[in-house]
């Protein structure tokens, strides 16, 4: 059983975690007191692994061209994606780009635009797809 402590001065929940105070579990960070951990504040900070941090990592705010795919929890950062009608290639740091409105002449659309990729077009007589 964990021993819950309450630090009145800052109003954060603390609990005794390990006798040596080396690591705190995901969703928490080290307190100023060795052996105690402070819970991250939902929507404000997170830690996704056991850690020796003195503060939770700040939640990311989605950019103006993005929307929230999943909110920040105490153990997971905010997940953002491009707004409908726009995309950004996986692992790219660029801004979201407008999806193509249609395929070039002689090509047909085989995949709709997603937040991670533009529409996909193929030649009418071919089965090989490629992005434009």
């Amino acid at each position: 059983a964990t021993i819950k402590l309450h630090d009145q001065s800052i109003g954060t929940q603390q609990w005794e975690h390990s006798p040596l105070g080396e690591l705190c579990p995901p969703g928490s960070h080290r307190s100023e007191r060795p052996g105690a951990c402070n819970r991250c504040t939902e929507g404000v900070g997170y830690t996704n692994a056991s850690n020796n941090l003195f503060a939770c990592l700040p939640c990311t705010a989605c950019k103006s061209d993005e929307e929230e795919r999943s909110p920040c929890t105490t153990t997971r950062n905010t997940a953002c994606q491009c707004k409908p009608g726009t995309f950004r290639n996986d692992n790219s740091a660029e801004m979201c780009r407008k999806c193509s409105t249609g395929c070039p002449r002689g090509m047909v659309k085989v995949k709709d635009c997603t937040p991670w990729s533009d529409i996909e077009c193929v030649h009418k007589e071919s089965g090989n797809g490629h992005n434009i």
Epitope: I10, P19, L20, P34, P58
Partner: antibody
Amino acid sequence: EVQLVQSGAEVKKPGASVKVSCKISGDSFTAYFIHWLRQAPGEGLEWMGWFNPISGTADSPQKFHGRVAMTRDTSISTAYMELTRLASDDTAIYYCARQHHSNTFDPWGQGTLVTVSS
Amino acid sequence: QSALTQPASMSGSPGQSITISCTGTSSDVGGYNYVSWYQQHPGKAPKLMIYAVTNRPSGVSNRFSASKSGNTASLTISGLQAEDEADYYCSSYTSSNTWVFGGGTKVTVLG
């Protein structure tokens, strides 16, 4: 009232080592993390690292790695900071401080002047 | 060179107000509400004046107040008094699990 009392001034030659002590009274020695900071003459404050008085583990910025050692003797409620391979730019007042809530330092020791001169 | 940027000196007459700025980055001041301010009189150890951006420890005069906007924190001393003449340092916790300080601001009370 919690008090941090540090050892006296030291004069060292370049290449030597210095060990500064910090005795805590008025509260449990192991209740809070201890930090070491320094201030060169006429300069600002520089954080040197944290020390866990329960486990004896410590961490410091890259610039001090391999040169600073933080230890303790819990029987006399005292923390130590040893700095090796001293150079003239290590001349500074060295402070110990306790970690207060919200990642601040309070209270502080009175400081220990370490002068490195040939 | 200090990680946080403060003006080297500021001055004011008794009764006036002065505001000291402290500029960092999104990895320190802007990323965390863990900005502190310390007062240091000559030959003395630093004294905590403000913690967690805006909070005053008990015993610190309410003439000292602080705030933060983006990557810049500010300390305001209102009704300046002779005993306020000192060096003031800002500090912030950082995303590297370390602490950084400003270079300090020397406050002079005129007259």
